[in-house]
């Protein structure tokens, strides 16, 4: 689940089994010139950044929940 910082895909691998409890925020990066795939980077309660699998049903559910809570705030 390492996160790179150069101008290329940031997610070198994704974490399995992510739980929403410790997720503070989620950044969804759309495909662009530097990376051909959608990337989902979560910031955890302890500040650590973790890459999530955008195709995972649970990740989709987490993103939806986070976006909805952002709208209601």
């Amino acid at each position: 689940a390492s996160v790179a910082t150069e101008l290329r895909c940031q997610c070198l691998q994704t974490l399995q089994g992510i739980h929403p409890k410790n997720i503070q925020s989620v950044n969804v990066k759309s495909p662009g010139p530097h990376c051909a795939q959608t990337e989902v980077i979560a910031t955890l309660k302890n500040g650590r950044k973790a890459c999530l699998n955008p195709a995972s049903p649970i990740v989709k559910k987490i993103i939806e929940k986070m976006l909805n809570s952002d709208k209601s705030n």
Epitope: A1, L15, Q16, G17, I18, H19, K21, N22, A42, L44, K45, N46, G47, R48, A50, I58, K61
Partner: antibody, heavy 119, light 107 residues
Framework: QVQLQQSGAELVRPGSSVKISCKAS????????MNWVKQRPGQGLEWIGQ????????NYNAKFKGKGTLTADKSSSTAYMQLNSLTSEDSAVYFC????????????WGQGTSVTVSS | DIQMTQSPSSLSASLGGKVTITCKAS??????IAWFQHKPGKGPRLVIH???ILQPGIPSRFSGVGSGRDYSFSIRNLEPEDIATYYC?????????FGGGTKLEIK
């Protein structure tokens, strides 16, 4: 490597209090939730609650809300659980367990502290 | 609170054989189930989390499957060191809740 070292066995009187400790090493103590779990003799495991040392945030099992108080000392990387108004029902082994940050699995456990409540 | 009904409470199996333990949740737990091995005088040991992900260092003889409310945990090619009590744990919703445990003995 990650280690959780718990304090020794306690023999205490009914109605009194006890404070047991769990000293963490090998990881950033402030960054991970610490859970506490109870096991009565011959029984299964029961989740008591958890504390996040970084900001002292806590979650308790309602069943234990008035019984246990969770605290943490960042300077010594030690989590504590105080049990109050002790009765024979509190005689048990108590475990601390670290919760991993991304998937909340309890991946490292202490060896357990035995508390015996007897007059 | 979510209830976890674990069965059987005890079982006896032969060395080299296979055992399966089940846990049924009182509601959908979104695959957030872990399985622990517990031996007397020690802290429990995480074997599997998120239904089927094996903890590093755990042999591939251990496996888990399930979804929704129904989950199972299997050990094949049983070895003497597998003698222990096994617990499921749901961590979908606080408070986390354990199953009642399954005591595994070797015939």
């Amino acid at each position: 490597q990650v280690q959780l070292q718990q304090s020794g066995a306690e023999l205490v009187r009914p109605g009194s209090s006890v404070k047991i400790s769990c000293k963490a090493s090998g990881y950033a103590f402030s960054d991970y939730w610490m859970n506490w779990v109870k096991q009565r003799p011959g029984q299964g495991l029961e989740w008591i609650g958890q504390i996040y040392p970084g900001d002292a945030d806590t979650n308790y099992n309602a069943k234990f809300k008035g019984k246990g108080t969770l605290t943490a000392d960042k300077s010594s990387s030690t989590a504590y659980m105080q049990l109050n108004s002790l009765t024979s029902e509190d005689s048990a082994v108590y475990f601390c367990a670290r919760e991993r940050d991304y998937d909340v699995a309890m991946d490292y456990w202490g060896q357990g502290t035995s508390v015996t409540v007897s007059s | 609170d979510i209830q976890m009904t674990q069965s059987p409470s005890s079982l006896s199996a032969s060395l080299g054989g296979k055992v399966t333990i089940t846990c049924k949740a009182s509601q959908d737990i979104n695959k957030y189930i872990a399985w622990f091995q517990h031996k007397p005088g020690k802290g429990p040991r995480l074997v599997i989390h998120y239904t089927s992900i094996l903890q590093p260092g755990i042999p591939s003889r251990f496996s888990g499957v399930g979804s929704g409310r129904d989950y199972s945990f299997s050990i094949r090619n049983l070895e003497p060191e597998d003698i222990a009590t096994y617990y499921c744990l749901q961590y979908d919703n606080l408070p986390w809740t354990f199953g009642g445990g399954t005591k595994l003995e070797i015939k």
